[in-house]
């Protein structure tokens, strides 16, 4: 299970760190990310970072997204049972999910910064 982001990281800083990490992942894709594993295409607008974390938690052996998982763990301040959103019915490749999560994160950052 990914460990928590260091306690001193405030939400705006953690969000910026997430954007940096996701940008690095999207730019560094020389080979298929996480062996083209598939994850649930969750509704980020409804479920936020907790839904993203839940979706990515199903991938256990991909070093490339470990830091993303750790940052998401720090940004998600709900228990798993509190995440109330309709269950997804579509799976997408991790690379596509990361791109979607990056766009969502940047939008949040620009609105809230």
């Amino acid at each position: 299970t990914p460990g928590p982001v260091r306690r001193s990281t405030s939400p705006p800083v953690a969000l910026r760190e997430l954007i940096e990490e996701l940008s690095n992942i999207t730019q560094d894709q020389k080979t298929s990310l996480c062996n083209s594993s598939m994850v649930w295409s969750v509704d980020l607008t409804a479920g936020g970072f907790c839904a993203a974390l839940e979706s990515l938690t199903n991938i256990s052996s991909c070093n490339a997204i470990h830091r993303t998982q750790r940052i998401l763990n720090g940004l998600c301040n709900q228990k798993a049972s509190d995440v109330a959103s309709s269950p997804p019915d579509t799976k997408i490749e991790v690379a596509q999910f990361i791109s979607k999560l990056l766009n969502y994160s940047k939008q949040l950052f620009r609105y809230g910064h």
Epitope: P12, V13, R16, I19, E20, S23, Q27, K106, Q107, F109, R110, Y111, H113
Partner: antibody, heavy 123, light 107 residues
Framework: EVTLRESGPGLVKPTQTLTLTCTLY??????????VDWIRQPPGKGLEWLAH???????RYNPALKSRLTISKDTSKNQVVLKLTSVDPVDTATYYC???????????????WGQGTLVTVSS | DIQMTQSPSSLSASVGDRVTISCRAS??????LNWYQQKPGKAPKLLIF???KLHSGVPSRFSGSGSGTDYTLTISSLQPEDIATYYC?????????FGGGTKVEIK
Amino acid sequence: EVTLRESGPGLVKPTQTLTLTCTLYGFSLSTSDMGVDWIRQPPGKGLEWLAHIWWDDVKRYNPALKSRLTISKDTSKNQVVLKLTSVDPVDTATYYCARTVSSGYIYYAMDYWGQGTLVTVSS
Amino acid sequence: DIQMTQSPSSLSASVGDRVTISCRASQDIRNYLNWYQQKPGKAPKLLIFYTSKLHSGVPSRFSGSGSGTDYTLTISSLQPEDIATYYCQQGNTLPLTFGGGTKVEIK
């Protein structure tokens, strides 16, 4: 080629509203990740950031001037407009618009600037 | 707001000299530091973004370094066309803020 061009009244009377227009060439504010900032520079002094607007109409202002500033865009004309109300002689400055891009990291770096338009506030 | 302090406010150096300009932020800006060059009567131009990334078309004699609150712009070999005022700007936190500028002159 990316260029920006500011236009303004040149001279404004105190208490009036200053309206500045920035016309964009070589890029469109309807394109994802594009943004435009306004910055001003009083004669012989440094730079002060005023406001910016993103392609999806997210707007941010300098809190010191927020109550007097309004930024908007007209995508069809590829223009960004800045309004500054209740002007005072201390608002005399060269006003610049500049492009910022949020692809990848959001650096808030202004990569292309207009030539600037000098605005004098005087009765 | 984050305060940006540049030093020196002005300097005079000879052609070929190595020139360094310092910029200090009032708090950690996590490398979100940009440098601009402004020649008399002209608009500023982006030189370096995110501490050390050279903007396209900028000569390689310009470089940037630093972290946390302290950053430096270096001109490895000053050229006559480098006469200008240089500004740092933090992009970590809104409102965006600029340093007071460093005027570079040729001896």
